[in-house]
């Protein structure tokens, strides 16, 4: 069992982990989520991304998620078990990244340029909120996230 | 071999209760969620209920919340299903399912056990 | 709460092509399943993640999903495929997994 995002593969993450870990906060994030009209991970950054794109667009937005919404959020929280959860979430999130090499090649340009844009699509969003805002929601978002990389998850 | 075996259906009237139990083995239950799925006769699939491995998180159909109790015995292997207050309307074979992602892949199903609510 | 629509009946020839479709509001975005179930026996997954097969699913057994529609295309359907088929998508606002309708494959 392992995901497959086109040609780099990920070994060691358990997809039933993350879930446990996100519904653990869920119902805290989405409360706290006052903007019910955006949506981050909206329907151009995550729909019909091919094989190809799909290790480029993963790197870029779960380096997102760790470097600028685990990382801030967890100087803003206290409570125990939501750091633990976000610690599970970020531990996987780590892993994930640290086996994916997408290609840097010449001629990977137009599909690295692809999932890029696609990666600005969500960022822009989130950048069109205040700090505390758009932490909140993109961590209500990691479900849709988890939804997504199913269809690069294989038996 | 992954093997999920459902027990406790039986006849029973409206407004009673039954719990049915599902005996998994063959792989590490507490590592994966579960999930109670019904069908009616002559109908289609309906998901019933979900619980997370470490049976922390559960969740229910609509119509079923509050009459229905899903929960699991991680050191017996073995899933239940706890129902009350039952309609005729409940009538149905109920599958247990293991979840291969967490959040509804049904790799494995058991063969079901049938509940019939009639006076 | 999330919708899914399947036709109630679908005809094929033998060894022609079948194919069952699925609709649900932006269902492209999520992990469509599939399940294919005989008479008094348990469902079993014939395809996931869209267009993945399980291991033992023959190849003729394939997926896609985009859009508004997922679809279950079985190329070459042979006698034996002639059953109950269920699309299947987990909807992560209502913490819930949604099944279709359930569409009758008849093979000719």
């Known amino acids: 069992q392992e995901f497959h995002f086109g040609p780099c593969q990920v070994k060691g993450v358990v997809p039933q982990k993350l879930w446990e870990a996100f519904w653990a906060v869920k119902d805290t994030m989405q409360a706290q989520d006052n903007i019910t009209s955006a949506r981050l991970l909206q329907q151009e950054v995550l729909q019909n991304v091919s094989d190809a794109e799909s290790c480029y667009l993963v790197h870029t937005l779960l380096e997102f998620y760790l470097k600028t919404v685990f990382k801030n959020y967890h100087n803003r929280t206290v409570e125990v078990r939501t750091l633990k959860s976000f610690s599970t979430l970020a531990n996987n999130f780590v892993l994930i990244v640290s086996q994916l090499q997408p290609s840097q090649e010449n001629e990977m340009f137009s599909i690295r340029d692809s999932a890029h844009r696609r990666f600005l699509l969500f960022r822009r969003a989130f950048k069109q909120l205040d700090v505390e805002a758009a932490l909140t929601k993109a961590l209500g978002e990691v479900d849709i996230l988890l939804t997504w990389m199913q269809k690069f998850y294989k038996l | 071999e992954v093997q999920l075996v459902e027990s406790g259906g039986a006849l029973v009237q409206p407004g009673g209760s039954l719990r049915l139990s599902c005996a998994a083995s063959g792989f590490t239950f507490d590592d994966y969620a579960m999930s109670w799925v019904r069908q009616a006769p002559g109908k289609g699939l309906e998901w019933v209920s979900h619980i997370s491995g470490n049976g922390h998180s559960t969740f229910y159909a609509e119509s079923m919340k509050g009459r229905f109790t899903i929960s699991r015995d991680n050191a017996k292997n073995t899933l239940y299903l706890q129902m009350n207050s039952l309609k005729s309307e409940d009538t149905a074979v109920y599958y247990c399912?293991?979840?291969?992602?967490?959040?509804?892949?049904?790799?494995?199903w058991g063969q079901g056990t049938q509940v019939t609510v009639s006076s | 709460s999330y919708e899914l629509t399947q036709s109630p009946s679908v005809s094929v020839a033998l060894r022609q092509t079948a194919k069952i479709t699925c609709g649900g509001d932006n269902i492209g975005s999520k992990s469509a399943q599939w399940y294919q179930q005989k008479p008094g026996q348990a469902p079993v997954l014939v395809i996931y993640?869209?267009?993945r097969r399980p291991s033992g699913i023959p190849e003729r057994f394939s997926g896609s999903n985009s859009g508004n529609t997922a679809t279950l295309t079985i190329s070459g359907a042979q006698a034996e495929d002639e059953a109950d088929y269920y699309c299947?998508?987990?909807?992560?606002?209502?913490?819930?997994?949604?099944f279709g309708g359930g569409t009758h494959l008849t093979v000719l």
């Open positions: 399912a293991k979840d291969d992602y967490g959040s509804g892949l049904y790799a494995y």
């Open positions: 299947q998508v987990w909807d992560s606002s209502a913490n819930a997994a949604v």
């Open positions: 993640a869209d267009s």
